[in-house]
């Protein structure tokens, strides 16, 4: 069926970057400026996305691909394809309806985006707090009692199966 259709439909021969122009006997015409077609056989070209205001151009539009936007400094992308820009805050803060606010005591945020999260409760794992938390950093839990016992092994444990929560700085 597909093969038959392609023989019958001259538009299927129009490559990406062109459109099948009904006004010109279905000739493949190049996409006009500021438009693109990312697949073949298109009957129209799509208007290029314009990165304006708080958005800035990460990748220019071409005849075969849309422009890509990111956010100006002080903002970060949200949503698929960076559909929105949200204001950055400092580490140790979170964005509220009233702007950036410091994390409450007992919570932290080690990024410029997102919300303040509670410090880890070390006692849930049978550990104690070794380094206190701050607005910017989680606590550090000490080793487990088994790690400190006289018979403790010095062998490095296997890598944890769960993804670590923080990246180095």
């Amino acid at each position: 069926f597909e093969r038959t259709r392609s023989l019958q439909d001259p538009c299927s021969n129009c490559p990406a970057g062109t459109f099948c122009d009904n006004n010109r006997n279905q000739i493949c015409s190049p996409c006009p400026p500021n438009s693109f077609s990312s697949a073949g056989g298109q009957r129209t070209c799509d208007i290029c996305r314009q990165c304006k205001g708080v958005f800035r151009t990460r990748k220019e539009c071409s005849s075969t691909s849309n422009a890509e936007c990111d956010c100006t400094p002080g903002f970060h992308c949200l949503g698929a394809g960076c559909s929105m820009c949200e204001q950055d805050c400092k580490q140790g803060q979170e964005l509220t309806k009233k702007g950036c606010k410091d994390c409450c005591f007992g919570t932290f945020n080690d990024q410029k985006r997102g919300i303040c999260r509670p410090w880890t409760n070390c006692s849930l794992d049978g550990k104690s707090v070794l380094v206190n938390g701050t607005k910017e950093r989680d606590v550090v839990c000490g080793p487990s009692p088994a790690d400190l016992s006289p018979g403790a092994s010095s062998v490095t444990p296997p890598a944890p199966a769960r993804e670590p929560g923080h990246s180095p700085q």
């Epitope: 880890t120 550990k127 487990s144 490095t156 890598a159 944890p160 929560g165 923080h166 990246s167 180095p168």
Partner: nanobody, 117 residues
Framework: QVQLQESGGGLVEAGGSLRLSCAAS????????MGWYRQAPGKQRELVAV???????NYADSVKGRFTISRDNAKNTVYLQMNSLKPEDTAVYHC???????????WGQGTQVTVSS
């Protein structure tokens, strides 16, 4: 895996100094905290000092004012400068590393420090 390699241990007279080094290698992307624990024969491993990637420190009371921990983040290395050593500082000194929160701890094989009176 995280590998920790210590160096700098040895025999020293009371009142003397030593500098321990520990280099981390391997999967160190989650390592934000490095430090030293020590273990005397038949005793529990105990904290000496730890330092975070943003240079917060914590020392055992018994070494405050005598020992100084520092780190070189670019080299993934932590140092322990030990001054005014006492016989009771004699132990195997283990390098240790972990992340923030309740992350797993990684341990070096240890380096022997012996302080003679």
């Amino acid at each position: 895996q995280v590998q920790l390699q210590e160096s700098g241990g040895g025999l020293v007279e009371a009142g003397g100094s030593l500098r321990l080094s520990c280099a981390a290698s391997g999967s160190i992307f989650s390592i934000n905290v490095m430090g030293w624990y020590r273990q005397a024969p038949g005793k529990q491993r105990e904290l000496v000092a730890v330092i975070t990637s943003d240079y917060s420190t914590n020392y055992a009371d018994s070494v405050k004012g005598r020992f100084t921990i520092s780190r070189d983040n670019a080299k993934n290395t932590v140092y322990l400068q030990m001054n005014s050593l006492k016989p009771e500082d004699t132990a195997v000194y283990h390098c240790a590393a972990t992340g923030y929160g309740s992350s797993p701890w990684y341990w070096g094989q240890g380096t022997q420090v012996t302080v003679s009176s």
